[in-house]
């Protein structure tokens, strides 16, 4: 009776187990009762990094110099190209799809150390009593407003992203 599951590096098609194509190769035709799976190597600037049944290889990533990118590691038929940023610039993500001179600190974080030519911005979370409501590459966390010194009371508590809201004291008549 036909198989319902296949071994590792095989796939089920037409009630038959066929070999997957090895990394660096794409599927041309499925196996039959009489023939093996037919695979072809990926072309120049293409790759497949897993055992697969893909009919098309993936294009290597392009490291766009207009975005500040350059090739860190050239792709092969089995691996994608790895991009990095020009010296002194920083990737915006692990995938390194674009470059920034230095990162900024999001709301809720303040700048602990401003970026230099050799180090990126260092951010720190705003502790209790401090806040930052902006993205910045130079601003520290700011202390909450002291309502008491203005003879006011706290109407709304502060957070790491918002200042306290002060209001008038309730006067007893």
């Amino acid at each position: 009776e036909p198989p319902t599951a296949c071994r590792e590096k095989q796939y089920l098609i037409n009630s038959q187990c066929c070999s997957l194509c090895q990394p660096g190769q794409k599927l041309v035709s499925d196996c039959t009762e009489f023939t093996e799976t037919e695979c072809l190597p990926c072309g120049e600037s293409e790759f497949l990094d897993t055992w697969n049944r893909e009919t098309h290889c993936h294009q290597h990533k392009y490291c766009d110099p207009n975005l500040g990118l350059r090739v860190q590691q050239k792709g092969t038929s089995e691996t994608d190209t790895i991009c990095t940023c020009e010296e002194g610039w920083h990737c915006t993500s692990e995938a390194c799809e674009s470059c920034v001179l230095h990162r900024s600190c999001s709301p809720g974080f303040g700048v602990k150390q401003i970026a230099t030519g050799v180090s990126d911005t260092i951010c720190e979370p705003c502790p209790v009593g401090f806040f930052s409501n902006v993205s910045s590459a130079f601003e520290k966390c700011h202390p909450w407003t002291s309502c008491e010194t203005k003879d006011l009371v706290v109407q709304q508590a502060g957070t790491n992203k918002t200042d306290v809201v002060c209001g008038p004291q309730d006067r007893l008549r």
């Epitope: 975005l67 674009s98 470059c99």
Partner: nanobody, 116 residues
């Protein structure tokens, strides 16, 4: 498309002054922190000065503190850098930049040469 056009550079004698301008377009200028960054010949990029969106808070590198003043006019979408008491070591190409400093959003810069 973000565009930043720096101007105002030139040749000036030590002790002299210059005012750089940066005309911004393609984004809501008043919403962004802005920076002046410079690159001296054969050197890396140096962060010179920054200003928050409202123009109420500023940052200056130690090397320019007390000599340079950053300002902005949000109604004119323009950033400024007033440079006084210029020194030979201020010679550089000056760029303005907006958060978050994407490589693709930089202008051509303006060259400042301080020499007698």
């Amino acid at each position: 498309e973000v565009q930043l056009l720096e101007s105002g550079g030139g040749l000036v004698q030590p002790g002299g002054s210059l005012r750089l301008s940066c005309a911004a377009s393609g984004f809501t200028f008043r919403d962004y922190e802005m920076w002046w960054v410079r690159q001296a010949p054969g050197k890396g990029l140096e962060r010179v000065s920054a200003i928050n969106p409202q123009g109420t808070r500023t940052y200056y590198a130690d090397s320019v503190k007390g000599r340079f003043t950053i300002s902005r006019d949000n109604s004119k979408n323009t950033l400024y850098l007033q440079m006084n008491s210029l020194r030979a070591e201020d010679t550089a190409v000056y760029y303005c930049a907006k958060l978050p400093f994407y490589f693709s959003e930089w202008g051509q810069g303006t060259l400042v040469t301080v020499s007698s």
